[in-house]
Interface confidence: low
């Protein structure tokens, strides 16, 4: 006959490990007892349990409550045992010694590897600002046994660098994602993907990028100067910019205070019926925590009477 076992048994931390040891013998052969021992213990073999065909299972004090037989139905030739609630310290080599009649004794060794699934964490880097050079966007750390893999899933262009720290029977892996911040990255997802044999599926942690920026400011509303004439109602100037964080707007007049009746409503400057007093240089001041921008425009309110008078003068002059 021969013993059937596995070269390597893999179990996830906290789960039960089945240590297989099955005697495949000729008909009529019997298994008297199966002795399980930790084969790589410091001071020789450390006994786990003795499985006797007549007296049942005896577990050594060091493993009391942790070694059981698999649930029924049981094959009398099966010397497999369950090691409950596997911990990293259980990693190593185990030996089963099977005493059979009449064939004698057989022994087999297996290696138990305890997988420790990682619990990844993602740490955002310092605040991202447009105009910076290569900057840390985020780092992702995962510790497990064996060493987990940490990768990044993103549409954002960047570079990754990884380092790992090995401990006893485990490793901590940290991957960093660096990028050159630009406004197009704002709101884009950056996902840390952690792979490990102890995980049923990859673990993913997503970080939304926030890049501080402030676009150039511009003013809309003066596209058709002929509309800015005395008496016109509903005239307005709108300041255009965008930023992260969203900017605030402030309007001033360069050549004096804002005329009475002119309303400031955020990015919009609203005028009452126009008079020539509304002519002047207006400044839109845009700012956020990152930066500030200015845009100025010259408003020239046309007085049709003045214009026609000038035209008459011009005609008579000719």
């Amino acid at each position: 006959g021969e013993l059937e076992t596995s070269d390597v048994v893999t179990v996830v931390l906290g789960q039960d490990a089945k240590l297989p040891c099955f005697y495949r013998g000729d008909s009529g052969e019997q298994v008297g007892q199966v002795a399980w021992a930790r084969a790589d213990a410091g001071e020789g073999a450390q006994e786990l349990a003795l499985l006797h065909s007549k007296y049942g299972l005896h577990v050594s004090p060091a493993y009391e409550g942790r070694v059981e037989q698999p649930p029924p139905p049981r094959n009398p030739l099966d010397g497999s045992v369950l090691l409950r609630n596997a911990v990293q310290a259980d990693e190593g080599e185990y030996e089963c010694r099977v005493s059979t009649f009449p064939a004698g004794s057989f022994q087999a060794r297996l290696r138990l590897r305890v997988l420790v699934p990682p619990l990844p964490s993602l740490n955002p880097g310092p605040a991202l600002e447009e105009g910076q050079g290569l900057t840390l966007a985020a780092s992702c750390t995962a510790e497990g046994s064996p060493a987990p893999s940490v990768t990044w899933d993103t549409e954002v262009k960047g570079t990754t660098s990884s380092r790992s720290f090995k401990h006893s029977r485990s490793a901590a892996v940290t991957s960093e994602f660096h990028l050159v911040p630009s406004r197009s990255m704002n709101g884009q997802p950056l996902t840390c993907v952690v792979s490990h044999p102890g995980l049923l599926q990859d673990q993913r942690i997503t970080h939304i990028l926030h890049v501080s920026f402030l676009a150039e400011a511009s003013v809309r509303g003066l596209e058709d100067q002929n509309l800015w004439h005395v008496g016109r109602e509903g005239a307005m100037l709108k300041c255009l910019s965008e930023g992260q964080p969203p900017p605030s707007y402030n309007w001033t007049r360069l050549d004096g205070p804002l005329p009475s009746g002119v309303r400031v409503d955020g990015d919009t400057l609203g005028f009452p019926p126009l008079t020539t007093e509304h002519s002047g240089i207006y400044v839109c001041h845009v700012s956020n925590e990152f930066s500030s921008r200015d845009s100025q425009v010259t408003v020239d309110v046309l007085d049709p009477q003045e214009d026609s008078g000038k035209q008459v003068d011009l005609v008579s002059a000719s």
Epitope: D7, T10, P146, S149, L199
Partner: antibody
């Protein structure tokens, strides 16, 4: 006993693709990463990448990014490596290997010949 | 990437002699992540040593590994006829995984 059995030799034309299989037996397929390593005639060993059979997660060597795809089918305990846009310098023996930190078991290798 | 440099490229020895193979890494490698493989013509590589100094299952004790940092050594205390082959070192602690170019141990 642990075995990694690979598919047979292939002859391909430049520009074509090849898909090599690696069937695992004798162990829990989803418990170990599978790596792919190639060896050009008379040359050394070159790592191509890995797949985590449990999750399907992959990691490819920079050199093969965009040309290599590693997949698996857990129902039949088989890993696959597909290399596209083949060139003559892709002629090599392709090995799968099981990772237990080190590569403790290897497939027998699959010779891929790229020739016009 | 970490470059592994093996020396000598070829080692010509007689059976019974001692073989000493060197593997130098361009950056320090934890000894836990260095392995040695043996490859015979037409065969797949076979794991000899893992963790720099641990013999794999079924490997005779004439094979031993040592070293740390950037210098690692594989020693075959007394060469047997079946030991003439190509030997590769490998680091598997840093991505990408890399191999040395190999040392051929041939019969003198």
């Amino acid at each position: 006993q642990v075995q990694l059995v690979q598919s047979g030799a292939e002859v391909k034309k430049p520009g074509a693709s090849v898909k090599v299989s690696c069937k695992a037996s004798g162990y829990t397929f989803t418990g170990y990463y599978i790596h792919w390593v190639r060896q050009a005639p008379g040359q050394g060993l070159e790592w191509m990448g890995w797949i985590n059979p449990n999750s399907g997660g992959t990691n490819y060597a920079q050199k093969f990014q965009g040309r290599v795809t590693m997949t698996r089918d857990t129902s039949i305990s088989t890993a696959y490596m597909e290399l596209s846009r083949l060139r003559s310098d892709d002629t090599a023996v392709y090995y799968c290997a099981r990772e237990d930190w080190d590569f403790d078991y290897w497939g027998q290798g699959t010779l891929v010949t790229v020739s016009s | 990437e970490i470059v592994l440099t093996q020396s000598p490229g070829t080692l010509s020895l007689s059976p019974g002699e001692r073989a000493t193979l060197s593997c130098r890494t361009s950056q320090s490698v934890s000894s836990s992540y260095l392995a040695w493989y043996q490859q015979k013509p037409g065969q797949a590589p076979r794991l000899l040593i893992y963790g720099a100094s641990n013999r794999a299952t079924g490997i005779p004790d004439r094979f031993s590994g040592s070293g740390s940092g950037t210098d690692f050594t594989l020693t075959i205390s007394r060469l047997e006829p079946e030991d003439f082959a190509v030997y590769y070192c490998q680091q598997y602690g840093s991505s990408p995984i890399t191999f040395g170019q190999g040392t051929k141990v041939e019969i003198k």
